[in-house]
């Protein structure tokens, strides 16, 4: 038996992907392990190979189908197992009954673009990726802007409590370089968490007009 504490955490992206991380203190580094997904009411099952992401944790993505296909519903329960090879046999290292729509983490928003920029403000839009039509408009967003001389961690969070795929940033400094990120979360799901942050969008405010009071 492998000693130490084990943690097996998975999230559904609401369409056709379940991402899992398995961490095990004292796990054997050279052991081949995989995640196996077995839905309770579907004809298919799926497997992915766990690959190391750190000393004692492994990750993999269960690709259930085409990226925008609705492969699971709110009624599905998926048995997820971590299986590791022991000689000629596979041993179950972790198991969970997974309710996909209680454990959501959407893909990071994409296609960030500057719609309009001025000296003190900037209008930015984005799109959500591979999000289920189930959510209708019941999504929320968090955004943050990186100012010169600060870190992302210091950036104040702006919360959008509805499905609004744009923001108008105000009180910016003229002729200044900024970066912007956004993330998304559905209201649904007891263990749902924020998506990863989007790729940063760099933009520069316009310089103040010469000889004018701005």
């Amino acid at each position: 038996a492998v000693n130490g504490t084990s943690q097996f955490t998975c999230f559904y992206n609401s369409r056709a992907n379940i991402s899992c991380v398995w961490s095990q203190d004292g796990a054997l580094q050279d052991t081949s392990c995989q995640v196996h997904a077995w839905p309770d009411r579907r004809r298919w099952n799926q497997t992915c190979e766990l690959l190391p992401v750190s000393q004692a944790s492994w990750a993999c993505n269960l690709i259930l189908g085409a990226p925008d296909s609705q492969k699971l519903t709110t009624v599905d329960i998926v048995t997820l197992r971590v299986l590791c090879r022991e000689g000629v046999r596979w041993r179950v290292m972790a198991i969970q009954d997974f309710k996909p729509f209680e454990n959501l983490r959407l893909m990071a928003p994409i296609s960030l673009q500057v719609v309009h920029v001025e000296t003190h403000r900037c209008n930015i839009s984005w799109e959500i990726s591979q999000a289920s039509h189930y959510f209708e408009r019941h999504l929320e967003f968090e955004a943050r802007t990186l100012s010169p001389g600060h870190t992302w961690e210091e950036a104040p969070l702006l919360t959008l409590k509805q499905k609004q795929e744009w923001i108008c940033l105000e009180t910016l400094t003229p002729d200044t370089q900024y970066e912007f990120q956004v993330r998304v979360k559905p209201l649904q799901g007891e263990f749902t968490t924020w998506s990863p942050w989007s790729q940063p969008l760099a933009f520069r405010t316009k310089p103040a007009a010469l000889g004018k009071d701005t």
């Epitope: 609705q70 209201l187 649904q188």
Partner: antibody, heavy 117, light 107 residues
Framework: EVQLVQSGAEVKKPGATVKISCKVS????????MHWVQQAPGKGLEWMGW????????EYAPGFQDRVTITADTSTDTAYMELSSLRSEDTAVYYC??????????WGQGTTVTVSS | EIVMTQSPATLSVSPGERATLSCRAS??????LHWYQQKPGQAPRLLII???QSISGIPARFSGSRSGTEFTLTISSLQSEDFAVYFC?????????FGQGTKLEIK
């Protein structure tokens, strides 16, 4: 403006089948879930099931799954609910509704079905 | 199947006063609880989702809260148009089920 317009009242004999339509407008029917709910005088609101218009997948409540069929015609933006082997306790108002799987955001006006010999 | 129990069955309150309606689930349902209002001869209307999130267009006097498996709908200052039947509905386990309703009537 979101609208769900249901077909008119029906009177049926026990053992017969009823089919109710729900014509929608004001939203994209092709990526919607369409639900059906029964409201019978003594039984309150009961969720019968839904259809995902995106892929045609259906989900039926156990109490109805032997007798109910939900369909969707994406060419006319219309959902249908067919209930067979009618009995007197099926006398009720039937609602179509639009929503995610978890709650019902918009409702039709209701269709009264009376089952009587 | 999860049983939703609403209390009281009928609640008599004067206009301008506060109304508190209760809904209890027979098992843990997290925050998967939604509230509807139904007036005579009309379809239900969605008010609150996930226990406490107000729906766009619903007046601010409607609010929801949760304590374990007990959920509360509060109407802070009753208007004449608020007298109706209120239903709760769980979406934790299929089949999703409704409470039997609380009739809010004018005192």
């Amino acid at each position: 403006e979101v609208q769900l317009v249901q077909s008119g009242a029906e009177v049926k004999k026990p053992g017969a089948t009823v089919k109710i339509s729900c014509k929608v407008s004001g939203f994209n029917f092709k990526d919607s879930l369409m639900h059906w709910v029964q409201q019978a005088p003594g039984k309150g609101l009961e969720w019968m099931g839904w259809i995902d218009s995106e892929n045609g997948e259906t989900e039926y409540a156990p109490g109805f799954q032997d007798r109910v069929t939900i369909t969707a015609d994406t060419s006319t933006d219309t959902a249908y609910m067919e209930l067979s082997s009618l009995r007197s306790e099926d006398t009720a108002v039937y609602y179509c509704a639009r929503g995610g799987p978890w709650f019902l955001s918009y409702w039709g006006q209701g269709t009264t079905v009376t089952v009587s010999s | 199947e999860i049983v939703m129990t609403q209390s009281p069955a009928t609640l008599s309150v004067s206009p301008g006063e506060r109304a508190t309606l209760s809904c209890r689930a027979s098992q843990i349902i997290s925050n998967n609880l939604h509230w509807y209002q139904q007036k005579p001869g009309q379809a239900p209307r969605l008010l609150i989702i996930y226990g406490l999130q107000s729906i766009s267009g619903i007046p601010a006097r409607f609010s929801g809260s949760r304590s374990g498996t007990e959920f509360t709908l509060t109407i802070s200052s009753l208007q004449s148009e608020d007298f109706a039947v209120y239903f709760c509905q769980q979406s934790n386990n299929w089949p999703y089920t409704f409470g039997q309703g609380t009739k809010l009537e004018i005192k």
